[in-house]
Interface confidence: low
């Protein structure tokens, strides 16, 4: 598809005649006729097979052809083809005499014609205008041609379809052969691929538009070149997708257990010392005159019950003072003023007399405690669980409740980190609070006994009698040098008589 | 001027279908998507899903599935959606809206930039 | 149908700036830079303000600014104006190929 563009640029008709020679009256008002067809050798009336076209009137006899005629003309004329141009072609242009202003063929006298061309030739599509003059005995007409494609068409022969586009089924402008040319950022055959980010990575990442860089899955990042962990990994990393390696400190399948509570946590309070004991777990000794598991609580003097006899205890500055029941006196109210007469026991407990009547003692039934057996048995008053263990009252029982890493009915034993078997070569294993430790036997050293040494056979003082001794340490034994007066192996004998032999 | 002109106000029974079209001008309709998006008086915009006017592919809501159907008639610029089983809930104004993508600096972008004026739909006995 | 999370309204004096926030997964916002935010006026269609998370159409005045973080988008307006009182839809493209919208918010000029 493209179009065959006339421009008309002169026009001479200086004695203002027709073809015939008859004089227009007043003037040749003139407007012209254009044929475009196929190429003939000799060019002969017919259809004319690629168009035509008509134009208004230009001028009278003489007259130069503006680009854009007024009017409504169009100069250049176009005539328009919607198939292959053939590189060939004839043109006929005639020049016509319009007496009035009825234009149409058959409105026109058969000699209103004042001239006529007819031109063949070869023509290749082109932005270049040919330029041409044509001259008969009593006109002239001076004109320009060319070929050019239709919008969207390119090529030789204008036959090639191009429509640059930017969307989904391409980003791309046409060059002057009708290959596309892709917009930037994007390639591929119709330009339909973009060009990803530079740098991402060519498996892990792709993209949907220029300079973009999607990450496939278990890949983040820029570029997509950062595995994404495992799906919940708290303080890990990984080198492949879905990994969690976890940091220093911290274990787990998601990393998310602590194995190192005092140093990320400070857990213990007023200065008391922090000791890991597992995952999560911790212990802390405290300074005195603290107390609870966090060595958070402050300990009053009084709550070790120092006063007796249903004495009430008031802390001081400088240390705390009994207020003791009616019959009792001194420091604690260890002092009585009663006697078994007095019926001093409760709760069904027994009186005993003693020192001779001026003092007494209680023995109380089970559950009941204190001088009088004034008070129920709180079988978690004396603390009796380690290790911060909680105590709970059960009825006429109690139980501890114990801190992770801890067992025991009061919870006085570690959870053994010696049931694994972590010494070696016949290693004994402790159990400590912060761990254990390998008692190790003769010959093996190391945290775990792990080391080899040579024995110094000496260190078991072998030798008797303040013999001297020496270690053969080719052989690891030992040899006794014995003082004056004793002999044998390990100068265990006293020289005496001679042995009195039985022969 | 690019333009989306939708179809007019319908009145719909239960369990009716309605067909809503959508007539673009102003730029070539099958380099951009349409999409339908509604919203009930009061209420949040609710979108049901796009077309390729090119290729005639769909994308629709999950809630919607089964019960929409978009299709386009490329020689008059139009796009219709049909909606089908109506129930009360279905009363809203019905939009559609140009997907187009956008170029700056070679790179290339996705925005619902031109609206239709919104057709209302009401689902009465 | 899954939607995105919106404040239901935010208000502020002329002149001032406010945030409106998004809130959707890794399957929607979160994945994807493809988050839109709308104005709409009472009886009007919607207004595209902003598309691709930043991007603003021309015409859109430059006082409307998005942006992105995680699953959460966020529209900013500063210089709050009379004219800026109407509702504002965020919508995010999701992994199944559809699009998602945001709750609505309503933003009140004081």
């Known amino acids: 598809s493209g179009v065959f563009q006339l421009q008309l640029q002169e026009f001479i008709n200086e004695r203002g005649v027709l073809a015939s020679g008859r004089p227009c009256e007043p003037g040749c008002r003139t407007f012209f006729r254009v044929c475009l067809k196929h190429f003939q050798a000799v060019v002969s009336p017919g259809p004319c097979t690629f168009g035509t076209v008509s134009t208004p009137v230009l001028g009278t006899n003489s007259f130069a052809v503006r680009d854009d005629s007024s009017g409504g003309g169009r100069n250049p004329l176009q005539l328009p083809f919607n198939f292959t141009w053939p590189g060939t072609f004839s043109l006929i242009i005639e020049a016509w005499h319009a007496p009035g202003d009825d234009l149409r063929p058959e409105a026109l006298p058969p000699d209103a014609l004042i001239s006529k061309i007819a031109i063949q030739g070869s023509l290749a599509v082109g932005q270049n205008w040919l330029l041409d003059e044509q001259t008969s005995t009593l006109t002239r007409l001076r004109y320009s041609y060319r070929v050019i494609c239709s919008d969207n068409y390119y090529g030789d022969n204008c036959s090639r379809l191009c429509k640059k586009r930017n969307d989904h089924f391409g980003h791309y402008v046409c060059q002057p052969d009708g290959n596309l040319s892709c917009l930037p950022g994007w390639t591929g055959e119709y330009c339909q691929q973009p060009i990803c980010l530079s740098g991402c990575h060519e498996q892990n990442g792709y993209c949907s538009k220029p300079a973009e860089c999607l990450c496939r899955p278990g890949w983040q990042g820029r570029l997509c070149n950062e595995c994404i962990p495992h799906n919940g990994c708290r303080h890990g990393t990984c080198s492949t997708p879905w990994q969690c390696t976890c940091d220093e400190g911290w274990g787990g399948l998601f990393c998310d257990q602590d194995l190192n509570y005092c140093t990320h946590h400070s857990p213990c309070k007023n200065g008391a010392t922090c000791s890991n004991s597992g995952q999560r777990s911790y212990t802390c000794t405290c300074r005195p005159g603290y107390t609870g598991v966090d060595c958070e609580l402050e300990l009053s003097e009084c709550d070790s019950n120092p006063c007796r006899n249903g004495g009430s205890c008031k802390d001081q500055e400088d240390g705390y003072h009994c207020l003791c029941p009616p019959g009792y006196y001194g420091l604690h109210c260890e002092h009585s003023t009663l006697s078994c007469a007095d019926s001093p026991c409760f709760n069904g407990g027994s009186c005993r007399e003693r020192n001779q009547g001026a003092n007494y003692a209680c023995e109380c039934p089970p559950n009941f405690t204190g001088s009088n057996c004034e008070k129920k048995v709180d079988r978690c008053t004396s603390n009796p669980c380690a290790n911060g263990g909680q105590c709970l009252n059960r009825g006429p029982s109690r139980m501890c409740r114990c801190r992770p890493g801890f067992t025991g009915t009061y919870c006085e034993l570690h959870v053994s980190d010696c049931a694994r078997n972590p010494c070696a070569h016949g290693g004994t294993c402790h159990d400590l609070e912060n761990g254990l430790m390998c008692t190790c036997p003769a010959g093996f050293s190391g945290r775990r006994c792990e080391v080899r040494t040579s024995i110094d056979a000496c260190a078991s003082s072998p030798c008797f009698n303040r013999a001297t001794c020496y270690t053969d340490l080719s052989t690891d034994t030992f040899v006794c040098n014995c003082p004056y007066g004793f002999v044998g192996s390990r100068c265990e004998f006293p020289v005496g008589l001679p042995p009195s032999f039985p022969w | 001027e690019v333009q989306l002109v939708q179809s007019g106000a319908e009145v719909k029974k239960p369990g009716a279908s309605v067909k809503v079209s959508c007539k673009a001008s102003?730029?070539?309709?099958?380099?951009?998507?349409i999409n339908w998006v509604r919203q009930a008086t009061g209420q949040g915009l609710e979108w049901l899903g796009w077309?390729?006017?090119?290729?005639?592919?769909?994308g629709y809501a999950q809630k919607f599935q089964g019960r929409v159907t978009m299709t386009r008639n490329t020689s008059i610029s139009t796009a219709d959606m049909e909606l089908s089983s109506l129930t009360s809930d279905d009363t809203a104004v019905y939009y559609c809206?140009?997907?187009?993508?956008?170029?700056?600096?070679?790179?290339?972008?996705?925005?619902?930039?031109?609206w239709g004026q919104g057709t209302t739909v009401t689902v009465s006995s | 149908q899954p939607v995105l999370t919106q404040p239901a309204s935010v208000s502020g004096s002329p002149g001032q700036s406010i945030t409106i926030s998004c809130t959707g997964t890794?399957?929607?916002?979160?994945?994807?830079?493809?988050v839109s935010w709308f104005q709409q006026h009472p009886g009007k269609a919607p207004k595209l303000m902003i598309y691709?998370?930043?991007n603003r159409p021309s015409g859109v005045s430059n006082r409307f600014s998005g942006s992105k973080s995680g699953n959460t988008a966020s529209l900013t307006i500063s210089g709050l104006q009379a004219e800026d009182g109407a509702d504002y839809y965020c919508?995010?493209?999701?992994?199944?190929?559809?699009?998602?919208f945001g709750t609505g918010t309503k933003v009140t000029v004081l």
């Open positions: 809206a140009r997907g187009h993508y956008y170029e700056s600096s070679g790179y290339f972008f996705y925005g619902m930039d031109v």
């Open positions: 102003g730029y070539t309709f099958t380099s951009d998507e």
């Open positions: 077309m390729n006017p090119h290729s005639g592919n769909t």
């Open positions: 890794s399957s929607d916002v979160g994945g994807y830079n493809y």
């Open positions: 691709d998370v930043n």
């Open positions: 919508s995010s493209y999701t992994s199944s190929s559809t699009y998602v």
